[in-house]
């Protein structure tokens, strides 16, 4: 229904705390360079204004759209052009073009320093002094580094953060209480970020229909006992929520997500038997819980689908009458039977089915033409299954770090023109799939592996889009979202690449590496590995292993030496020489 004042409506629905948090996230995602204090000031002004509209919906400007109100605030920031360059040009436009312009200027890889966690005592002190400001800083720092982070989920992670600090700051050993718990939240939040970015990419590049297909497949797997009408309703609502968040309409998004959670909890009987535990939780936890609820038990006696989608004489008639509904039903029926498939795979099968009907229904004898379509799915199913088996076997053999290195070599060979930091980040993230997925039961491995890889590769594509350097990557990234992972997997050594010259300074290290945390040490070694592959793209795995083992031995020796600096300066050049010889 229409409200006289949109801002008053959202303030009332969300409550002050969530309202302020969401406005802070919105501003931080749009203007990623501004300080927390600058944004906090704007948030307070918007909140004060919202309160005046709650008191009197007819007050001046209360009838304005949220985009107009927020955009006007952002455009009033002093020194906008100095700090943001051409983003300031957005302010010359009218809504809705102005908001579209802000969205186009979101930076997926802002040049901000890594978000460093203060040491435990300092964190607890500032948290106790002002929990609200502390949490505000958290929202601001995460949102500006992840401009598409799913806003209501970020509120959930902030709440988790709050609970951990409340608990651990009361302990004697704050550090050992905080570190594993906060590491856990950070890991989950980073995965949430890449997954949501993938959804926004789907929405931006291929529109609502593509996202809705994704939602139908995912929801049908999770709720196999719900009927098609129920799945369609949930998919439509979920598409609206995600469209709003991806479009920067964070208040509407959070409000509609809360409504969707409410609807699901009020209609458990027709959706799933697994929702009650989630529905007993408070709002943020409830919505989060519902988003990752375990799959309901599959119905015992689902018939084969060939009767309706291949053997029925009316297939082409049914398809022609309502293409999207017919294909949606196919996707629903296939997905509810296969919780063991990835959503990407299910969408590839639906796409193949659609292409077959398009071709066959135009022919003289359609049934003879589409009669074998389900059998033709077999290679599409076998390919990701083999990928999972091969990669999980390799992960089990090498462990996470070794597996990351194997992927790093593979991807540097596929796209050696890509910058080393991007290759290292991608390989480290892709390599985590082993730890995340390979330990799961058989029927959960494929969906875990492929959907996670797809999200990571989406980030590779976004970073590459900014500065395109590899034709291989451009080719895989310009196709459909669900074909990306198979495309990257199929890439081989880039034969067009001219190897990099060997530069000794690339492989020169100093004693400061010894005091780095383990993760940073790994990144240094992986950077060297990528550079080695760029120098010798056709080096064998054995050659690379020899060099890396030598390198590890060199670090170990020099970091244990009494005079580290001398060891690095004398042994370093010897290492470089040995490397060159080993790769000759």
């Amino acid at each position: 229904e229409a409200h006289k004042s949109e801002i008053a409506h959202r303030y009332n629905d969300l409550g002050e705390q969530h309202f302020k948090g969401l406005v802070l996230i919105a501003f931080s995602q749009y203007l990623q360079k501004c300080s927390y204090d600058e944004h906090a000031k704007l948030v307070q002004e918007v909140t004060d204004f919202a309160k005046t509209c709650v008191a009197d919906e007819s007050a001046a400007n209360c009838d304005k759209s949220l985009h107009t109100l927020f955009g006007d605030k952002l455009c009033a920031i002093p020194n906008l052009r100095e700090n943001y360059g051409e983003l300031a040009d957005c302010c010359t436009k009218q809504e809705p073009e102005r908001n579209e312009c802000f969205l186009q200027h979101k930076d997926d890889n802002p040049s901000l320093p890594p978000f460093e966690r203060p040491e435990a005592e300092a964190m607890c002190t500032s948290f106790k002094e002002n929990p609200t400001t502390f949490m505000g800083h958290y929202l601001h720092e995460v949102a500006r580094r992840h401009p598409y982070f799913y806003a209501p989920e970020l509120l959930y992670y902030a709440e988790q953060y709050n609970e951990i600090l409340t608990q651990c700051c009361a302990e004697a050993d704050k550090e050992s209480c905080l570190t594993p718990k906060l590491d856990g939240v950070k890991e989950k939040a980073l995965v949430s970020s890449v997954r949501q970015r993938m959804k926004c990419s789907s929405m931006q590049k291929f529109g609502e229909r593509a996202f809705k297909a994704w939602a139908v497949a995912r929801l049908s797997q999770t709720f196999p006992n719900a009927d098609f009408a129920e799945i369609t309703k949930l998919a439509t609502d979920l598409t609206k929520v995600n469209k709003e968040c991806c479009h920067g309409d964070l208040l509407e998004c959070a409000d509609d997500r809360a409504e969707l959670a409410k609807y699901m909890c009020e209609n458990q009987a027709t959706i799933s038997s697994k929702l009650q535990t989630c529905c007993d939780k408070p709002l943020l936890k409830k919505a989060h819980c519902l988003s990752e609820v375990e799959h309901d038990t599959m119905p015992a006696d689902l018939p084969a689908i060939a009767a309706d989608f291949v053997e029925d004489q009316e297939v082409c008639k049914n398809y022609a009458e309502a293409k999207d509904v017919f294909l949606g039903t196919f996707l629903y029926e296939y997905s509810r039977r296969h919780p063991d498939y990835s959503v990407s795979l299910l969408l590839r099968l639906a796409k193949k089915y659609e292409a077959t009907l398009e071709k066959c229904c135009a022919e003289a004898n359609p049934p003879a033409c589409y009669g074998t379509v389900l059998a033709e799915f077999q290679p599409l199913v076998e390919e990701p299954k083999n990928l999972v088996k091969t990669n999980c076997d390799l992960y089990e053999k090498l462990g996470e770090y070794g597996f990351q290195n194997a992927i790093l070599v593979r991807y540097t060979q596929k796209a050696p023109q890509v910058s080393t930091p991007t290759l290292v980040e991608a390989a480290r993230n892709l390599g985590r799939v082993g730890t995340k997925c390979c330990t799961l039961p058989e029927d959960q491995r494929l969906p875990c592996v492929e959907d996670y890889l797809s999200a990571i590769l989406n980030r590779v594509c976004l970073l590459h889009e900014k500065t395109p350097v590899s034709e291989h990557v451009t080719k895989c990234c310009s196709g459909s979202l669900v074909e990306r992972r198979p495309c990257f997997s199929a890439l081989t050594v880039d034969e067009t690449y001219v190897p990099k010259e060997f530069k000794a300074e690339t492989f020169t290290f100093h004693s400061d590496i010894c005091t780095l945390p383990e993760k940073e040490k790994q990144i240094k070694k992986q950077t060297a590995l990528a550079e080695l592959v760029k120098h010798k793209p056709k080096a064998t795995a054995e050659q690379l292993k020899t060099v890396m083992d030598d390198f590890a031995q060199f670090l170990d020796t020099c970091c244990k030496a009494a005079d580290k600096d001398t060891c690095f300066s004398t042994e370093g050049p010897n290492l470089v020489t040995r490397c060159k010889d080993a790769l000759a």
């Epitope: 689902l302 084969a304 296939y334 389900l374 059998a375 199913v381």
Partner: nanobody, 115 residues
Amino acid sequence: QVQLVESGGGLVQPGGSLRLSCSASGSIWGIYHMGWYRQAPGKGLELVASITVDGSTHYADTVKGRFTISRDNSKNMVYLQMNSLEPEDTAVYYCDIRNVGGDYWGQGTQVTVSS
């Protein structure tokens, strides 16, 4: 062509046990359902137990606690362990394996529970 072969049926005394096996030969992929059905003389076909791709198991009320269905994915095999057998369990037992493309049935194996 897919063929299912059941084995393990026979004559057993009340309270006894049997283990039925079903193996699929030929190219069957993308299995989402494996089940055992039975048909007693003069009766219709009834679902005894099924196991879906996610590992969920379903049992007819009359066999709950006595029968256990299991599978071996790598070999496309499905089993039915039947304990505390009763005369009412006498029937021909059929194995059923499904993928989206079709429903594949065995020829059946006779189970007779009698003293």
